[in-house]
């Protein structure tokens, strides 16, 4: 039987909560890595690919050491929301061109959505201040060409890959301080 009605729930161990968030982040990172390999194989594109609408990488090494849990989770959630928007945009705008990557892109979007919900839950469990709803972001312009869309895909997956590594590092560092 659970606790009697009205009694406070036992607060979950924050380290265990962070651990499961790290594992979900790493599984998403592996999905991203495998999808990046497929993208490079099917649509090779040399050089750096940037997309102005993507978030800039959150932190450098020095800043990582000074991080606090609220700022990591807040920043990570904001960045991942942006990547989720970009993945949705990519699937809509490039549906036919990226058909060969479609099941994996769908899986990636689902897991990204799940990680965002996990971060939201973690923030409420740790009694961190809840963010106001995000203002609606301006719509992303459709890619100017198929090639532009492919370059955008490289930029989105590359940025997400690096953001997730930063996230894992930040969360692991914070876990040791709890």
């Amino acid at each position: 039987p659970g606790p009697p009605p009205g009694s406070p729930r036992a607060s979950p161990d924050p380290r265990a909560e962070l651990d499961s968030t790290v594992l979900l982040t790493r599984s998403l990172l592996e999905d991203t890595r495998q999808l990046t390999i497929q993208l490079k194989d099917k649509f090779p594109a040399d050089g750096d690919h940037n997309l102005d609408s993507l978030p800039t990488l959150a932190m450098s090494a020095g800043a990582l050491g000074a991080l606090q849990l609220p700022s990591v989770l807040t920043r990570l959630r904001a960045d991942l929301l942006s990547y989720l928007r970009h993945v949705q945009w990519l699937r809509r705008a490039m549906g036919s061109s990226l058909k060969t990557l479609e099941p994996e892109l769908g899986t990636l979007q689902t897991r990204l959505d799940r990680l965002l919900r996990r971060l939201q839950l973690l923030m409420s469990r740790l009694a961190l201040p809840q963010l106001p709803p995000d203002p609606p972001a301006p719509p992303l312009a459709p890619p100017s060409s198929t090639w532009g869309g492919i370059r955008a895909a490289h930029a989105i997956l590359g940025g997400l890959h690096l953001t997730l590594d930063w996230a894992v590092r930040g969360l692991l560092l914070l876990k040791t301080r709890l």
Epitope: R26, E30, R33, L57, M59, A61
Partner: antibody, heavy 119, light 111 residues
């Protein structure tokens, strides 16, 4: 060809420090982490830590925290590991290894650098 | 830290035979759809070489006679038909938590 080339063997006295380099070629340096692994005679392989070349931000095995320092020179595609306050148990082969981001498995290894600590 | 125990410590077989190497973890290393176990081969005087990552994925360039399986705490590396160059020491490694740790190794020798 993807390669990691490490600096040569070192002989050090107890209490001294050693700095090993690992030069990467044949791939985009920033796309992978660089990990360091110790193999002492008759012991298991032991992970020391890793560093993300883009972010910096090393992560260390607690056992080596405070004694190991991982750095990178992005412009030279080179990673470094410095180990301080050397003792006889640090006598080992040290490997750099390319690691998938945040996954800690190692698909390309350097040839190893033998460090001997002896008075 | 998670402890990995490999068995047997050594194994003597002939070329053409099937080799089955075991790795047991002190706690589950499978979660969120992935099993964080990897296998390496090491020959004397050489660096380890990645064979299998994430329990069952064959690393590029590794012959198809190598395969990995398992989940939870029990994992297996199988070499379907041994070749002369397969006689070496094999290590499993986990990356479920930090620090990643390695098994003590299984030495595969020619009978």
């Amino acid at each position: 060809e993807v390669q990691l080339v490490q600096s040569g063997a070192e002989v050090k006295k107890p209490g001294a420090s050693v700095k090993i380099s690992c030069k990467a070629s044949g791939y985009t340096f920033r796309d992978y982490n660089m990990d360091w692994v110790k193999q002492a005679p008759g012991q298991r392989l032991e992970w020391i830590g890793d560093i993300n070349p883009t972010i910096g931000a090393p992560i260390y095995n607690q056992k080596f925290t405070g004694r190991a320092t991982l750095t990178v020179d992005k412009s030279a595609s080179t990673a470094y590991m410095e180990l301080s306050s050397l003792r006889s148990e640090d006598t080992a082969v040290y490997y750099c290894a390319r690691g998938a981001l945040a996954h800690w498995y190692f698909d390309v290894w350097g040839q190893g650098t033998t460090v001997t600590v002896s008075s | 830290d998670i402890v990995l125990t490999q068995s047997p410590a050594s194994l003597a077989l002939s070329p053409g035979e099937r080799a089955t190497l075991s790795c047991r973890a002190s706690k589950s290393v499978s979660t969120e759809g992935y099993s964080y176990i990897h296998w390496y081969q090491q020959k004397p005087g050489q660096a380890p070489r990645l064979l299998i990552y994430l329990a069952s994925n064959l690393e590029s360039g590794v012959p198809a006679r190598f395969s990995g399986s398992g989940s939870g705490t029990d994992f297996t590396l199988t070499i379907s038909s041994l070749e002369e160059e397969d006689f070496a020491t094999y290590y499993c490694q986990h990356s479920r938590d930090l620090p990643p740790t390695f098994g003590q190794g299984t030495k595969l020798e020619i009978k």
